[in-house]
């Protein structure tokens, strides 16, 4: 049966793609796998292949994939086999926009919001869980309130801020009893006031490749908080930046390629090159963050010709401290993130 | 597991359209092509065309050039294929397709059974 | 276009008997090639795909085997379970079936 494009169709005339990938096209039954799984580098998932028999390491972001090799499905990854048409048998693989997220075992939409707790608002993008604070740490003006402390308050989610005057007899903070700080309470006064609040960037979602950071802002026609997301690096995953710590340091703070690249993002290409720093690592237990960055506006440009553009967060500089917490634990940076947002907005 | 789950069966008049939808589950529906193939009654397998649900490119055989349309909503995980001009010898079993290696483990739909009859 | 033609079109065999289907491609198809079954009734299933890979399930007693323009089937003992409808495919270029070979029960 000959082919006849329809209208809409470019020429899909198939051509063979050679497999460069050194592991197994194809499944065999019954399985042989190694007598050990291998050990993948850092960020790489160890995984069971296609074949359902062993584990390998998973494909990642523009390697070739096929049903035995299969694309990193943490890195919400799949196997764009369009370019093999119609022998689907060797794909590369490429990110979807707008992959769900699993958090704690629900699956949440793409671009779905939701509280999976009292005290935080997350949003599900791209595959990554950003999340923000509800209750907001504004602290009170030193000027009338010198020694503040948050206090827990049975039925309230929210710790609020206390003073402590001088006669250490503990009283609210906001005068004319103004909520509190808690987050209703600011939300309305917000509302009545129109004061403008945009909340710092929320930690990245991810220590390595691709995720996503979030941050509420009211500072719009209607007044009201809304959550704004960027996508996020902190550092590649493929790259061993341990290796690059001088002799006698403990710690890399910035690592910046020495080529330009061009960003990709579920199999488009950013319009334009850059040459990013990322934050680099330590030989002991500090982790290294950004402390200097801003959000910049990235173009991209798909092969079916469509375009749109991602904010995305630029880093000049990072600091490494001792304030880690569980890498797996998305809720732990927001506890104790440093408010930078004077210099990193 | 994967799924395609098509549509009931139609009894349509000589030179009416039929639509049939295939609903896809346990995949992602954009990441793969849907094709579609025929079985008129008492025959072989008879291929009609694909579509990439991803971005709605379309590619049709071309026998059926100018009288199948093949679309999709991926809200809901759903494509169509639409026969216009229909004739009796359109009749037949119409099966969706998962594109994936000679489908294997892909699962073809259970089929629509298409009656044309005046 | 790439014409597929199968033989026989019917084979009848008893249940313990080696059955041996051929495809033709009228063009090299290289090793695009997949077998299916089909029950009445049912949807078409694949057995092999890529001319000799057995697909995930399928028992041991079917293979395939052939590259380029000749192709065969080989189910090494017939169980009850395989008296169907047998039909190859390639998909080198799109997809083209062949006839279809019926087995049935001798």
């Known amino acids: 049966t000959a082919l006849s494009p329809a209208p809409t169709t470019m020429d899909f005339t198939p051509a063979p793609l050679e497999d460069t990938s050194s592991r197994p096209q194809f499944c065999k039954w019954p399985c042989e796998c190694p007598p050990s799984p291998p050990r993948c580098p850092l960020g790489v998932s160890l995984i069971t292949d296609g074949c359902e028999c062993c584990k390998m390491c998973a494909q990642q972001l523009g390697d070739n994939c096929t049903e035995a090799a299969i694309c990193d499905p943490h890195r919400g990854l799949y196997c764009d086999y369009s370019g093999d048409r119609p022998r689907y048998a060797i794909g590369v693989c490429a990110q979807v926009v707008g992959v769900g997220c699993v958090l704690d075992g629900v699956r949440y939409n793409n671009g779905q919001s939701f509280q999976p707790n009292c005290k935080y608002n997350c949003t599900c993008i791209d595959g990554a869980v950003g999340c923000t604070p509800l209750c907001l740490r504004v602290r009170p003006p030193r000027l009338w309130c010198p020694h503040p402390r948050r206090v827990s308050i049975p039925g309230h989610c929210c710790e609020q801020w206390v003073c402590e005057d001088d006669a250490k007899r503990p009283r609210k903070t906001a005068p004319r009893d103004t909520g509190a700080f808690d987050a209703v309470g600011e939300v309305e006064a917000w509302h009545r006031n129109c004061i403008a609040y945009t909340s710092p960037w929320s930690p990245c979602s991810t220590s390595c490749g691709l995720g996503v950071s979030t941050r509420i802002s009211n500072v719009n026609a209607q007044c009201w908080p809304e959550q704004e997301s960027r996508l996020c690096n902190l550092r590649p995953c493929d790259v061993d930046i341990h290796t690059l710590i001088k002799a006698g340091k403990k710690c890399l703070a910035v690592y910046q390629p020495e080529a330009s690249m061009n960003f990709t993002l579920a199999g488009c290409i950013s319009t334009r090159s850059y040459q990013p720093k990322y934050c680099g690592v330590c030989m002991d237990n500090r982790c290294c963050i950004p402390y200097k960055s801003k959000t910049i506006d990235v173009s991209f440009q798909c092969p079916d010709g469509l375009g749109f553009s991602r904010q995305v967060l630029w880093i000049n500089a990072c600091f490494c401290n001792l304030s880690c917490r569980n890498p797996n634990d998305i809720f732990a940076d927001l506890e104790s993130y440093p408010d930078f947002s004077e210099i990193a907005n | 597991q994967v799924q395609l789950v098509q549509s009931g069966a139609e009894v349509q008049k000589p030179g009416a359209s039929v639509k049939v939808s295939c609903k896809a589950s346990?995949?992602?529906?954009?990441?793969?092509?849907i094709h579609w193939v025929r079985q008129a009654t008492g025959q072989g397998l008879e291929w009609m065309g694909w579509?990439?649900?991803?971005?709605?490119?379309?590619g049709y055989a071309q026998k059926f050039q100018g009288r199948v349309t093949m679309t999709r909503d991926t809200s809901i995980s759903t494509a169509y294929m639409e026969l216009s001009s229909l004739r009796s010898e359109d009749t037949g079993v119409y099966y969706c397709?998962?594109?994936?290696?000679?489908?294997?483990?892909?699962?073809w739909g259970q089929g629509t059974l298409v009656t044309v009859s005046s | 276009d790439v014409v597929m033609t199968q033989s026989p079109s019917t084979l009848s065999a008893s249940v313990g008997d080696r059955a041996t289907i051929t495809c033709r491609a009228s063009?090299?198809?290289?090793?695009?090639l997949a077998w299916y079954q089909q029950k009445p009734g049912k949807a078409p299933h694949v057995l092999i795909y890529?001319?000799?890979n057995l697909n995930s399930g399928v028992p041991s007693r079917f293979s395939g085997s052939g590259s380029g323009t000749e192709f065969t089937l080989t189910i090494s003992s017939l169980q009850p379970d395989d008296f169907a409808t047998y039909y190859c495919?390639?998909?080198?270029?799109?997809?083209?079936f062949g006839q279809g070979t019926k087995v049935e029960i001798k």
């Open positions: 397709v998962r594109g994936i290696i000679a489908a294997a483990g892909g699962g």
């Open positions: 346990g995949y992602r529906f954009i990441n793969n092509d």
């Open positions: 579509m990439d649900p991803n971005n709605g490119k379309t």
């Open positions: 063009q090299s198809v290289d090793t695009w």
């Open positions: 890529k001319a000799s």
């Open positions: 495919q390639q998909y080198k270029t799109w997809w083209t």
